[in-house]
């Protein structure tokens, strides 16, 4: 299953299969994700090692059993991979480090006036993997707001340097924000030249391009077909690149197709895995496993379950049946490829489903009345659960936030339906920024169901939680996607970065925005709390977040939004916003409906119709 | 409208014990906290404890532990101070009051005379 | 236990005077302070909660101002219905009121 865990001051000992330099350990941990054979990694930031060479060290790692020996190391940080955990998975990374040098070969400078634009840069950039940019503070005035843009073999810094005033990060290209665009046709009987940058086999165009779209320097890609004039050149997928980012050549050629890596693409990524089942092939590999089972999607499904395994053979010969089963060939190879593909089997072959981002049917949760006031413009897929909660009766209106907890699932404040309980007028618009954006022809959601809280009572503030069933599930993207719940009465974890977000008003007395709003705001506690509301129960149900000052709050329009918060690299549903006195006023708080405590009604109420829990119960 | 109506004047010997009652209206009891204060007689104003009708969680006065005891019965919207071992020092009016952080609307009081 | 030290125990003033309370803790308070009106046979009445916050309904000639443990309350023009007594009272940590102030028409 899938494990989100890390381990302070742990080191993993043995099971190496590469290694790289990381600026911090979510960013081993995504590598570890899309490695084919990494289940675990352990990463050494800067102050947990004297030794130069090994600072920023991210160890992937993999075990026959799933697990590894762990050593105390203080400062060190472990975990597991995110393969198996649906829609967590991602390449995007966002994250800026400062008083950081990422190195690679600088191939483009330029001056910038923030890392935000370096950032964009590296992100239009077809060759830019990582960027470094010196701030204005720079101890060399020649070098500052120089932008840098680099790459490396791997895709990963070849050595990080703490270095003052310099702040570095990635390119957003895998977050589907490139402005560069892509190339989505497949050029059939066209070979491209260049430089081939990795070889492996694949059993059609497609899984090629998707490979090569999630390898680090691949640009363009040939793939020789199964009838191809050369046998040992059969069904290989050729990874290329060039200095200019574009072949510079093609040859018409028979039997081979060519296609470019969707990396580029803005809006829409493939996932990372490869859904399909070749009927009448065999994948062959290293044999992980045998079992017996009745079909070929339950043999899919065992591979997808078994962590390790990264594609299987279901066999239909006779002497491999018994009854209704017959043998399921689970197996793997270094690169996560079949080391061989034969055809015209009695078999059927295919890929296991770990790394797609749909997963089942589930929502995350973690193993372990009131725009927003004093905010800032947010950018695209930065909070993909984000929703808009509209109402149309004569005119169309933005009236509440929400969050995507899952496909099918919106969770939400109680009080947003008070008065409008008829799920007709409302209309649920998700993965996007901008409500002008909104027409007539923006995809909604509708509601089939409205779930309010069996002890919310209208004008009160106690138990404003109300969850809304989706008329059809949504499909999850870079900027639609659910965010986590916290574990069932998750009291012991100390959140420290977060934010509220909606596009409520921007003072009391305001008016809906455009753009939706982030805020990062502090939680104050519940006894701190109290002593600022003299007529309110602040009770253990709710989750208080504020400035001593003021001047940053939600407001009117934010109402059923997220307050998430950022722990270990993961965000979590901490809170919806329910109410406050006015907005963003001094010593007054804003109050959340705290999620932790209601995490029992809310996977109750998600039970689907056969009985089946549409959400992962937390540990 | 928002009312705590608290139980009549009471005389009792000393050393008996005595229970008040304060019903609220306009609201519910679960959705606040009550408070209990003591007003001597040509005296100030002293807290007693705060209970939580939803949940029963109690906070006393450390100078009052054991002489008061708080509880709620939320189906009937009441809420009580049971006093025991009564001595003429206890002779007051005990007020119930509602809030959050702090007591927002008080009943009128209730006299306690404590005489042998 | 916090203490809460009220003055003057009583004072008389005209109608219209400025009326000034004080109240001395002996911790800081971080500002969890408020000031109760009672007048006889009545139970007592918030006026001000968090320093200076002025509770709904209560007219804008009470204030208050303070920090750390040294606080004030303010009738900015006394009135005849403002013939009461008026207690400081803490919410720092549990509850402690002051002594009072017994205020008269002169």
């Known amino acids: 299953g899938c494990l989100t865990q890390l381990y302070e001051n742990a080191f993993f000992r043995g099971g190496d299969v590469a290694s790289m330099y990381t600026p911090n350990a979510q960013y081993c941990q995504m590598r570890c994700t899309f490695h084919p054979r990494c289940l675990l990694f352990s990463f050494l930031p800067a102050s947990s090692i004297n030794d130069m060479e090994k600072r920023f060290g991210c160890f992937l790692k993999d075990s026959v059993t799933g697990t590894l020996p762990k050593v105390h190391r203080t400062g060190a940080v472990s975990g597991h991979s995110l393969k198996q955990c649906g829609h967590q998975i991602s390449a995007c990374h966002r994250d800026i480090y400062k008083g950081v040098d990422m190195r690679g070969v600088n191939f483009n400078v330029s001056k910038v006036s923030s890392v935000e634009e370096c950032q964009k840069r590296c992100t239009s950039n077809i060759r830019c993997q990582f960027f470094s940019y010196a701030t204005q503070t720079f101890h060399k005035a020649e070098y500052r707001n120089n932008c840098l843009l680099k790459y490396s073999p791997g895709g990963t810094p070849t050595a990080i340097k703490v270095l003052s005033n310099v702040e570095s990060g990635f390119s957003l290209k895998p977050c589907a924000l490139s402005e560069i665009g892509c190339h989505m046709n497949i050029f059939q009987h066209l070979a491209f030249s260049d430089v081939d940058v990795a070889r492996v086999l694949t059993p059609d165009a497609f899984v090629c391009r998707t490979i090569c779209t999630y390898h680090p320097n691949c640009l363009f890609f040939t793939f020789y077909t199964n009838v191809w004039k050369i046998e040992s050149q059969r069904n290989v997928c050729l990874l290329k690149t060039s200095e200019s980012g574009t072949p510079s050549s093609s040859t018409p050629q028979e039997n081979t197709i060519s296609g470019y890596s969707l990396l580029t693409c803005k809006r829409t990524l493939p996932e990372p895995c490869h859904s399909k089942i070749y009927p009448g092939v065999d994948f062959g590999g290293e044999e992980l496993n045998v079992t017996f089972v009745k079909g070929v999607n339950v043999c899919q499904e065992t591979c997808t379950k078994m962590i390790r395994c990264q594609f299987f053979t279901y066999s239909l010969l006779p002497e491999d049946c018994k009854e209704e089963k017959c043998k399921c060939f689970l197996r793997l190879s270094m690169d996560g490829s079949p080391t061989r593909i034969a055809y015209g089997t009695q078999g059927s072959s295919g890929y296991s489903l770990r790394l797609c981002n749909t997963g089942d049917n589930s929502v995350c949760t973690t193993k372990t009345s009131t725009r927003i006031v004093g905010g800032t413009n947010s950018s695209w897929g930065e909070w993909p659960w984000q929703v808009s909660l509209q109402v149309k009766l004569t005119a169309q209106r933005h009236l509440c936030g929400g969050s995507l907890i899952g496909h099918q699932w919106v969770l939400t404040a109680a009080h947003c339906f008070d008065g409008l309980p008829l799920q007709d007028v409302w209309r649920i618009y998700s993965g996007i920024l901008n409500l002008s954006d909104i027409t007539k022809d923006t995809p909604f959601s509708q509601i089939k169901e409205i779930i309010i809280h069996q002890n919310y009572k209208v004008s009160e503030g106690n138990h404003d939680i109300a969850l809304i069933k989706l008329q059809a599930p949504l499909n999850y993207t870079e900027f639609q996607k659910p965010i986590c719940l916290p574990s069932k009465g998750d009291t012991s974890t100390i959140y420290t970065n977060c934010w509220v977000t909606g596009w409520g008003f921007s003072k009391e007395k305001g008016e809906i925005q455009n753009i939706l709003q982030k805020v990062n705001i502090p939680l104050v506690t519940n006894e701190e709390c109290q002593k600022r509301y003299q007529d309110y129960k602040i009770t253990q149900r709710m989750v208080c977040a504020g400035y001593k000052e003021g001047g940053k709050d939600a407001c009117k329009g934010d109402s059923g939004g997220p307050l998430v918060c950022k722990h270990n690299g993961m965000w979590r549903l901490v809170g919806i916003t329910s109410w406050g006195e006015g907005c963003a006023r001094r010593e007054q708080p804003g109050v959340y409906t705290k999620v932790a405590e209601y995490m029992d009604w809310i996977l109750e109420k998600t039970q689907s119709s056969d009985g089946k829990a549409q959400m992962q119960s937390p540990a | 409208e928002v009312q705590l109506q608290q139980s009549g004047a009471e005389l009792v010997k000393p050393g008996a014990s005595v229970r008040l009652s304060c019903t609220a209206s306009?609201?519910?009891?679960?959705?606040?906290?009550i408070f209990w204060v003591k007003q001597r007689p040509k005296q100030g104003l002293e807290w007693i404890g705060r209970?939580?009708?939803?949940?029963?969680?109690?906070k006393y006065d450390p100078k009052i532990q054991g002489k008061a005891t708080l509880t709620a019965d939320t189906s009937s919207n009441t809420a009580y101070l049971q006093l025991s071992s009564l001595t003429s020092e206890d002779s007051a009016i005990y007020y119930c009051?509602?809030?959050?952080?702090?007591?927002?609307?008080w009943g009128q009081g209730t006299l306690v005379s404590v005489s042998a | 236990d916090i203490q809460m030290t009220q003055s003057p125990s009583a004072m008389s003033a005209s109608v219209g005077d400025r009326v000034t309370i004080t109240c001395e803790a002996s911790?800081?308070?971080?500002?969890?302070i408020a000031w109760y009106q009672q007048k006889p046979g009545k139970a007592p009445k918030l006026l001000i909660y968090?320093?200076?916050t002025l509770q709904s309904g209560v007219p804008s000639r009470f204030s208050g101002s303070g920090s750390g443990t040294d606080f004030t309350f303010t009738i900015s023009s006394l009135q005849p219905e403002d013939i009461a007594t008026y207690y400081c009272l803490q919410y720092d940590n549990l509850f402690t009121f002051g002594q009072g102030t017994k205020v008269e028409i002169k």
């Open positions: 911790h800081d308070i971080n500002n969890y």
């Open positions: 968090y320093t200076s």
């Open positions: 209970i939580d009708p939803e949940n029963d969680n109690t």
């Open positions: 306009g609201f519910n009891i679960k959705d606040t906290y």
């Open positions: 009051a509602k809030g959050g952080g702090l007591f927002a609307y």
